[in-house]
């Protein structure tokens, strides 16, 4: 029960997050403009990452798209590129994630294969929240760089007569949505790894040795491990629960191969 | 068509108040920001105050600050302007205009109102 | 604040002449953001109330006539009218609609001769 609620509040936190993810990618106010020393302005700037956007006081509008490709700086390529990759990722591992998910059955599926599924999910879901988080703090870096420069330009063009206002940008709501957005995501990945660990199915499981008449070479493995004669194909690939409750120190003691996170 | 109609003006005394009302009419008053704008006799244009379409923003002339107060009643389409502590120097016609086109152009004007100040 | 200066105070031309007149702006009315000068011409006849006539520094509002052109970037505009005609007798002021508060010039008379 713990499993299946896992599993799907890692889904729906990844949902969320992916959601963050594209509207933070869509959203036009990556960068806006700093009001701090024109507080009254009556033009305002902000830009996202395919736009540029100017709002009027009057109320009117006007967006212009970033036409070039080759004219724009690496950073916003990267920045660009980064997103895409997290919303792809996320998108891939919340089409894997349905299909993992304990609460559906499809077909005869097994349970080791909607744990790897989960498994995968789970990745896919932390590198895709982590590309979200990158793409963010890079744009982020990108803008604390500019604004200390066109600081500096400023106050240092003050002589003349005429003073040009120059528009410094700081940030928009488009980066708060992205790192929380990318934060869920990632949250989400971790809930699906940890689900995972849970739908796995356990190996054979015994606390004592196994006896057979007429075994020689019995294999004695503590807790946790396969007990198998070496004769006989009926016992090969025969999986045996325990049914008994484990404690924590044993799980730890002897993890699965599900464990490697 | 658009029309804006100011009314309130009149003789007010030095020191005293006075409320200047705008009905506008023939577009979706709620969408835009209004200005007022005075002309004093034989002088130039001098813009006084400007409304956001919901109140969010408004700003004053240095000239008027602290003395008038900007409004407006958007369901019944109209703008105020509360003016306290008239000065001679406030005797002007007054204008309420929009901001209905781009580049903040004042596109539409009212026909203004009169205000004098005098003793 | 913004401060308009327009020159001359006032100008007399015979009608079709072509005339010019300036308006210096204290700071830069340029938005980086969209490329665009955010100064506006008005014209005002005796009598009349306020018109507007050019926005952005050059763009001419519909159904102004052509012979109106404005020019200029960041802090020096220019209203021209190319061959003046009667009706164009009025007061042009230049404003700013960059910041608050949205200050105007004092005003160029046209007088006819």
């Known amino acids: 029960m713990a499993v299946t609620a896992c599993q799907g509040l890692g889904f729906v936190v990844s949902l969320i997050g992916i959601a963050g993810i594209i509207a933070a990618t869509c959203m036009d106010q990556w960068s806006t403009q700093d009001l701090y020393n024109n507080p009254v302005t009556a033009v305002f700037n902000y830009q996202g990452l395919w736009r540029s956007c100017v709002r009027e006081s009057s109320g009117f509008t006007e967006c212009r798209g970033y036409f070039t490709l080759l004219g724009l700086p690496a950073m916003l390529q990267a920045v660009r590129a980064l997103m895409i990759v997290g919303i792809v990722l996320g998108a891939i591992g919340l089409l894997v994630s349905i299909f993992a998910l304990k609460c559906i059955r499809i077909g005869s599926m097994e349970d080791s294969a909607k744990a790897n599924m989960t498994l995968t999910s789970g990745i896919m879901f932390i590198v895709s929240g982590l590309c979200a988080i990158a793409g963010v703090s890079v744009f982020a870096n990108m803008l604390v760089t500019n604004f200390w420069m066109s600081t500096a330009n400023m106050y240092t063009g003050m002589g003349g007569m005429v003073q040009t206002v120059q528009t410094r940008y700081t940030f928009g709501a488009a980066l708060f949505v992205g790192w929380v957005a990318g934060g869920l995501t990632l949250i989400g990945g971790v809930m699906m790894c940890i689900a995972c660990r849970g739908l796995a199915p356990e190996e054979t499981n015994y606390k004592a040795v196994s006896y057979h008449a007429s075994g020689h070479s019995v294999a004695y493995k503590p807790g946790g491990f396969k007990a198998s004669t070496g004769f006989g194909s009926n016992t090969k690939n025969k999986k045996i629960y325990d049914g008994g409750a484990r404690t924590e120190d044993e799980v730890q003691s002897y993890p699965s191969k599900h464990d490697y996170v | 068509d658009v029309q804006l109609v100011e009314s309130g003006g009149g003789l007010v005394q030095p020191g005293g108040s006075r409320k200047l009302s705008c009905a506008a009419s023939?577009?979706?008053?709620?969408?835009?920001?209004m200005h007022w704008v005075r002309q004093a006799p034989e002088k130039g244009l001098e813009w006084v105050a400007y409304?956001?379409?919901?109140?969010?923003?408004?700003y004053y002339a240095d000239t008027v600050k602290g003395r008038f107060t900007l409004s407006r009643d958007n369901p019944k389409n109209t703008l105020f302007l509360q003016m306290t502590s008239l000065r001679s120097e406030d005797t002007a016609i007054y204008y309420c205009?929009?901001?209905?086109?781009?580049?903040?152009?004042?596109?539409?004007w009212g026909q203004g109102t009169s205000v004098t100040v005098s003793s | 604040d913004v401060v308009l200066t327009q020159s001359p105070s006032s100008l007399t031309v015979t009608e079709g002449e072509k005339v010019s007149m300036s308006c210096k702006s204290s700071?830069?009315?340029?938005?980086?953001?969209?490329?665009?000068?955010?100064l506006t011409w008005y014209q005002q006849k005796p009598g009349q109330t306020p018109t507007l006539l050019i926005y952005w520094a050059s763009t001419r509002k519909s159904g102004v006539p052509d012979r109106f052109t404005g020019s200029g970037s960041g802090t020096d505009f220019t209203l021209t009218i190319n061959t003046v005609q009667a009706e164009d007798l009025a007061v042009y002021y230049c404003?700013?609609?960059?910041?608050?508060?949205?200050?105007f010039g004092a005003g160029t008379k046209l007088d006819l001769k």
């Open positions: 205009a929009t901001s209905y086109y781009y580049g903040n152009a004042l596109e539409y």
């Open positions: 023939g577009f979706t008053f709620s969408s835009f920001g």
């Open positions: 700071q830069s009315l340029f938005n980086l953001g969209n490329q665009k000068n955010y």
């Open positions: 409304i956001s379409s919901g109140s969010g923003s408004i």
């Open positions: 404003q700013n609609v960059y910041s608050y508060p949205l200050t």
